[in-house]
């Protein structure tokens, strides 16, 4: 008789999840000399230990502490790029501007990027059928708690000028319910961070509006100002040209507004 299995609303664990995590860890530690000391088998064991045999709606930040410890990494605190709802462009940017880092450019972010995972209470099985959805099922699920934990730590580490890339095509350019709005903004440390600089990325080629005047951007400034962190905002009217100019800053067309 097949054992009854909890049906969650979200997609199940990504296929070949253990192999993917292990392979990504090996690849990352090969490319990044400062992380060569990391034992990827131990990393996988710690990752697995955070959610296996645990109820997938009962995960805590504490569960991820062994993994956090193994994945401890120092990135230049003044070279941090946060993003919200515009991951691809943020990653394209840091691939060109190699001295800046998104969370997914760190080991732990790289391991988990675009993956889903969950286990089952009291069994050592990984659930490949379904996992809890943040909205429909529960917020304390393995994936959400992981990203909340690493995002908090990433924001806490930031200093000087912190940049954030925001999607100007969305109805809420700054969304307080996003990871940036609910976790990262509140964990920037005012004694270390002088300025948060927002880059609002425009979608349409003919869009010449000043999206820095958007009400949600003013809301972001309002939150940041109470924490005594300065705020600045720039429109990126042409993201394609923006990336091109990061690659080739000497290009004559790069002196005009992008």
């Amino acid at each position: 008789v097949p054992r009854w299995r909890q049906q969650w609303s979200g997609p199940g664990t990504t296929k070949r999840f253990p192999e993917t995590v292990l392979a990504r860890c090996v690849k990352y530690t090969e490319i990044h000399p400062e992380m060569r000391h990391v034992d990827c088998q131990s990393v996988w064991d710690a990752f697995k230990g955070a959610f296996i045999s645990k109820h997938p709606c009962n995960i805590t930040e504490e569960d991820y502490q062994p993994l956090m410890k193994l994945g401890t990494q120092t990135v230049p605190c003044n070279k941090i790029l946060l993003w919200s709802r515009i991951k691809d462009l943020a990653h394209q940017f840091t691939q060109v501007q190699r001295d800046m880092f998104t969370l997914e450019d760190t080991l732990l972010g790289y391991l988990a990027d675009d993956l889903t995972w969950c286990g089952e209470f009291n069994t050592s099985k990984i659930n490949y059928q379904s996992c809890p959805d943040w909205r429909k099922d529960c917020s304390n699920n393995p994936v959400s708690v992981f990203w909340k934990t690493v995002s908090r730590r990433f924001a806490e580490a930031a200093c000087d000028v912190v940049h954030v890339m925001l999607n100007g095509s969305r109805s809420k350019i700054f969304d307080k319910n996003s990871t940036f709005g609910s976790v990262e903004v509140h964990n920037l440390q005012p004694e270390k961070v002088q300025t948060l600089e927002a880059w609002v990325i425009h979608g349409g080629r003919e869009d010449s509006r000043d999206l820095c005047q958007d009400p949600t951007i003013k809301e972001l400034e309002s939150i940041i100002s109470k924490r005594n962190i300065q705020f600045s905002c720039k429109n990126i009217y042409r993201p394609d040209k923006f990336l091109q100019c990061v690659k080739n800053p000497e290009d004559s067309s790069c002196t005009s507004e992008i």
């Epitope: 307080k176 009400p215 949600t216 100002s225 109470k226």
Partner: antibody, heavy 118, light 110 residues
Framework: EVQLLESGGGLVHPGGSLRLSCAAS????????MNWVRQAPGKGLEWVSS????????YYADSVKGRFTISRDNSKNTLYLQMNNLRAEDTAVYYC???????????WGQGTTVTVSS | QSVLTQPPSASGTPGQRVTISCSGS????????VNWYQQLPGTAPKLLIS???QRPSGVPDRFSASKSGTSASLAISGLQSEDEADYYC???????????FGGGTKLTVL
């Protein structure tokens, strides 16, 4: 001239309801987070509630959570405070105040008095 | 019980310098915006010091403020009779997601 003008206060029995209004003029209301602060007779200032620029987010003091609702109508330049299930300890002068980034609660109204008594 | 702690009263003679203290914690005074408000008898509070130490326009330079760690203080030099009022410190509190006030200090000019 930047001005906030509260209205809607009065005498109400315990368990009753009141709706306070705050009319703004002289500044772009829709650019500011707005707040209600109260002061019980002979006591200090107590923050009650705030509402974000867009109105999407609201915050409340524990003492009023579940009983008071803050809202705003940017087209009418008006802030509201719906107060239900009022208690004697809600008796106070209620002020509205705007939050100006990097300044604080910048401009205050003259206040409206709410008395909850049987 | 107020989140921020102020002395309930302070006094001084005309021309004197008076200081009012305000004590809080990491989640409010240390890392966030601190303001001081003056409330003259029978009137609404008025912003006296913004952004920890700045005086809004129209506030005399006799009023100054400082902040160190989890404490803030307001200094009034050259005390005048019209300075007789209640003074409140306030700060944004991260952990409460709220504005928090001190209990207020009643300043008497003798």
């Amino acid at each position: 001239e930047v001005q906030l003008l509260e209205s809607g206060g009065g005498l109400v029995h315990p368990g009753g309801s009141l709706r306070l209004s705050c009319a703004a003029s002289g500044f772009t209301f829709s650019d500011y987070e707005m707040n209600w602060v109260r002061q019980a007779p002979g006591k200090g200032l107590e923050w009650v509630s705030s509402i974000s620029i867009t109105g999407d987010f609201t915050y409340y003091a524990d003492s009023v959570k579940g009983r008071f609702t803050i809202s705003r109508d940017n087209s009418k330049n008006t802030l509201y405070l719906q107060m239900n299930n009022l208690r004697a300890e809600d008796t106070a002068v209620y002020y509205c105040a705007n939050y100006k980034s990097y300044y604080g609660l910048d401009v205050w109204g003259q206040g409206t008095t709410v008395t909850v008594s049987s | 019980q107020s989140v921020l702690t102020q002395p309930p009263s302070a006094s001084g003679t005309p021309g004197q310098r008076v200081t009012i203290s305000c004590s809080g914690s990491n989640s409010n005074i240390r890392y966030n915006l601190v303001n001081w408000y003056q409330q003259l008898p029978g009137t609404a509070p008025k912003l006296l010091i913004s952004n920890n130490v700045q005086r809004p326009s129209g506030v005399p330079d006799r009023f100054s403020a400082s902040k160190s760690g989890t404490s803030a203080s307001l200094a009034i030099s050259g005390l005048q009779s019209e300075d007789e009022a209640d003074y409140y410190c306030a700060a944004w509190d991260d952990s409460l997601n709220a504005w928090v006030f001190g209990g207020g200090t009643k300043l008497t000019v003798l």
